[in-house]
């Protein structure tokens, strides 16, 4: 498994990571940590593992956290209710 660096699918990344779009270069995907408490997220980011190619630069939130709306169009990883 690729622990950091370029990837195409989640299966190439280590535990606690997903293969997300690079913030810097949209055409590249890199192994990215799953969302921690307080991290920005998107509510429809695919679960891990996802067998297709992700379009977002964020990973799903870590287990026990949920991607919740805090204001219009702003979502953050927060403890599940």
């Amino acid at each position: 498994a690729v622990i950091t660096g370029a990837c195409d699918k989640d299966s190439q990344c280590g535990g606690g990571m997903c293969c997300a779009v690079s913030i810097w270069v949209k055409s590249i995907r890199i192994c990215t940590p799953m969302g921690k408490l307080g991290d920005s997220c998107h509510p429809l980011t695919r679960k891990v593992p996802f067998f297709g190619r992700r379009m977002h630069h964020t990973c799903p939130c870590l287990p026990g956290l949920a991607c919740l709306r805090t204001s219009f169009n702003r979502f953050i990883c927060l403890a599940q209710k």
Epitope: P43, L44, R46, K47, F51, G52, R54, M55, H56
Partner: antibody
Framework: EVQLVQSGAEVKKPGASVKVSCKAS????????MHWVRQAPGQGLEWIGY????????TYNQKFKGRVTITVDKSTSTAYLELSSLRSEDTAVYYC??????????????WGQGTLVTVSS | DIVMTQSPDSLAVSLGERATINCKAS??????????MNWYQQKPGQPPKLLIY???NLESGVPDRFSGSGSGTDFTLTISSLQAEDVAVYYC?????????FGQGTKVEIK
């Protein structure tokens, strides 16, 4: 060839439950999510929810929460939709549809033939 | 929920002419520069068929007379040269926010 074959038409009484099956073939079942969509007679399309066929994680339209259950049986490559507390407004054709794995752009690329569920006293 | 409104409700176009269907979302369906909008075609007695995903991407096997455009809240499906087999109902669908919602449909007929 990808195929989604659904169970046959059902007639149910108000208050009853119905379970519709969708048997997939021609692809790796656990690599794709499965959506369920319904269409009332002469009406438009309404999304019910979807399931990860890999780990069973579900996302439901809140409108149906508490009445709908989507499950999968990986051993038979079959997805199921169960709808309870049926009412006349639930009369519709119910479709399963495979998600195409286009990243976060959820899109339904293959559809079952549809199952007509009629709710009538 | 995001409300999708299509216009017109029905459309009659001559064979070989251009058909244009509009879809307006009650709020933006964009995220990080991508537009989360799909278009489907449904013929009588058949399930829907995916034509366009993520606003402008042509699904494999779909004729290139179909195209999608738009961003934010306003989207368009264009059939550049209408063929007899294009007679159908067309639906837009937003997939940026759950629940995924469809427009009410636009019926396309031959004039």
């Amino acid at each position: 060839e990808v195929q989604l074959v659904q169970s046959g038409a059902e007639v149910k009484k108000p208050g009853a439950s119905v379970k519709v099956s969708c048997k997939a073939s021609g692809y790796s079942f656990t690599d794709y999510d499965m959506h369920w969509v319904r269409q009332a007679p002469g009406q438009g399309l309404e999304w019910i929810g979807y399931i990860s066929c890999y780990n069973g994680a579900t996302t439901y339209n809140q409108k149906f929460k508490g009445r709908v259950t989507i499950t999968v049986d990986k051993s038979t490559s079959t997805a199921y939709l169960e709808l309870s507390s049926l009412r006349s407004e639930d009369t519709a054709v119910y479709y399963c549809a495979r998600d195409g794995n286009y990243g976060e752009a959820y899109a339904m690329d293959y559809w079952g033939q549809g199952t007509l569920v009629t709710v009538s006293s | 929920d995001i409300v999708m409104t299509q216009s017109p409700d029905s459309l009659a176009v001559s064979l070989g002419e251009r058909a244009t269907i509009n879809c307006k979302a009650s709020q933006s369906v964009d995220y990080e520069g991508d537009s989360y909008m799909n278009w489907y075609q449904q013929k009588p007695g058949q399930p829907p068929k995916l034509l366009i995903y993520a606003a402008s991407n042509l699904e494999s096997g779909v004729p290139d007379r179909f195209s999608g455009s738009g961003s934010g809240t306003d989207f368009t499906l264009t059939i550049s040269s209408l063929q007899a087999e294009d007679v159908a109902v067309y639906y837009c669908q937003q997939i940026n926010e759950d629940p995924f919602t469809f427009g009410q449909g636009t019926k396309v007929e031959i004039k």
